[in-house]
Interface confidence: medium
């Protein structure tokens, strides 16, 4: 029960996280103009990964996409790439984890397969979260560098009428959304990995039992059936040994060195 809860919670947390990463990637407020010490301007600028926006004092807002790749800095391209990789990995992770959920039965899928899928999706969520956190952090670092350079330029060129006002930009809402979303995806991934340990069946120590039958050679099959040569009376493969019978949820049978005696 605890395993199912951990897995389900991990899935939900990751789902919220990935939705947040997608939202952050699409948002325009990655950087917003810092209006401190610049009361003259009637224009407020803010930028996203994909477009730049201008809001005028009248309330009119206009956004315009970056229609070129060549003029954009490599760092911005890197941030875009990290966020997209994070979304893609997260989306695949979600798809895998849906089939891995213990509460969902798909055919005769064994717990070992579900455990592997849970682990896979967990790792994908962790990497997805790390990509988002890395992307947002790289952009934040660019902003901080630009901010302090702008501040330095502001106070070194104040003689007479200032020809250039180095506009300072500060953290936009998208950065905070991205950090939180990346963290949630990471936490969800860790929960999935923890759930995987509970899902994985423990190694069963099979007892070696030898069977002696008169007249025919007998082999023990993993399912507990007598393998008939075809000449005996047990042609319908009836179960002849049920001593160690357990329910499907209690134990899964795997081929091991003790399967054939």
């Amino acid at each position: 029960m605890a395993v199912t809860a951990c897995q389900g919670l991990g899935f939900v947390v990751s789902l919220i996280g990935i939705a947040g990463i997608i939202a952050a990637t699409c948002m325009d407020q990655w950087s917003t103009q810092d209006l401190y010490n610049n009361p003259v301007t009637a224009v407020f600028n803010y930028q996203g990964l994909w477009r730049s926006c201008v809001r005028e004092s009248s309330g009119f807002t206009e956004c315009r996409g970056y229609f070129t790749l060549l003029g954009l800095p490599a760092m911005l391209q890197a941030v875009r790439a990290l966020m997209i990789v994070g979304i893609v990995l997260g989306a695949i992770g979600l798809l895998v984890s849906i089939f891995a959920l213990k509460c969902i039965r798909i055919g005769s899928m064994e717990d070992s397969a579900k455990a592997n899928m849970t682990l896979t999706s967990g790792i994908m969520f962790i990497v997805s979260g790390l990509c988002a956190i890395a992307g947002v952090s790289v952009f934040a670092n660019m902003l901080v560098t630009n901010f302090w350079m702008s501040t330095a330029n502001m106070y070194t060129g104040m003689g007479g009428m200032v020809q250039t006002v180095q506009t300072r930009y500060t953290f936009g809402a998208a950065l905070f959304v991205g950090w939180v979303a990346g963290g949630l995806t990471l936490i969800g991934g860790v929960m999935m990995c923890i759930a995987c340990r509970g899902l994985a069946p423990e190694e069963t120590n099979y007892k070696a039992v030898s069977y002696h039958a008169s007249g025919h050679s007998v082999a023990y099959k993993p399912g507990g059936f007598k393998a008939s040569t075809g000449f005996g009376s047990n042609t319908k493969n009836k179960k002849i040994y049920d001593g160690g019978a357990r329910t499907e949820d209690e134990v899964q049978s795997y081929p091991s060195k003790h399967d054939y005696v």
Partner: nanobody, 121 residues
Framework: QVQLVESGGGLVQPGGSLRLSCTAS????????MHWYRQAPGKQRELVAS???????HYADSVKGRFTISRDIAKKMQYLQMNSLKPEDTAVYYC???????????????WGQGTLVTVSS
């Protein structure tokens, strides 16, 4: 080095016309809007007209119907056509633009040195 240079100011009689020009020079990657401000003696600087990246124009109430802002993106120029000038339009007119330099993400605000417009009979 990016620079804005205005021209076209001067003395004009009330009811007359003037055309101000502003040229942006340097390695400019993107223009995030161009504006005209003015500052009358003893008053605060005010926004007169602006043109957005896609060409939408806005005007201060005091100049609506008399002033027209336009631009030529290829030449990196903006213009302010001033008609039916009044004595209260007397001020130093400043060209202002938000420009992104090549290889940059964020726009900086650039100002021209200002050109004086005097409306007097």
């Amino acid at each position: 080095q990016v620079q804005l240079v205005e021209s076209g100011g001067g003395l004009v009689q009330p009811g007359g016309s003037l055309r101000l020009s502003c040229t942006a020079s340097g390695s400019i990657f993107r223009i995030d809007g161009m504006h005209w401000y003015r500052q009358a003696p003893g008053k605060q600087r005010e926004l007169v007209a602006s043109i957005t990246p896609s060409g939408i124009t806005h005007y201060a109430d005091s100049v609506k119907g008399r002033f027209t802002i336009s631009r030529d993106i290829a030449k990196k120029m903006q213009y302010l056509q001033m008609n039916s000038l009044k004595p209260e339009d007397t001020a130093v007119y400043y060209c202002n633009a938000h420009l992104v330099k090549v290889g940059g993400v964020w726009s900086d605000e650039y100002w021209g040195q200002g050109t004086l417009v005097t409306v007097s009979s």
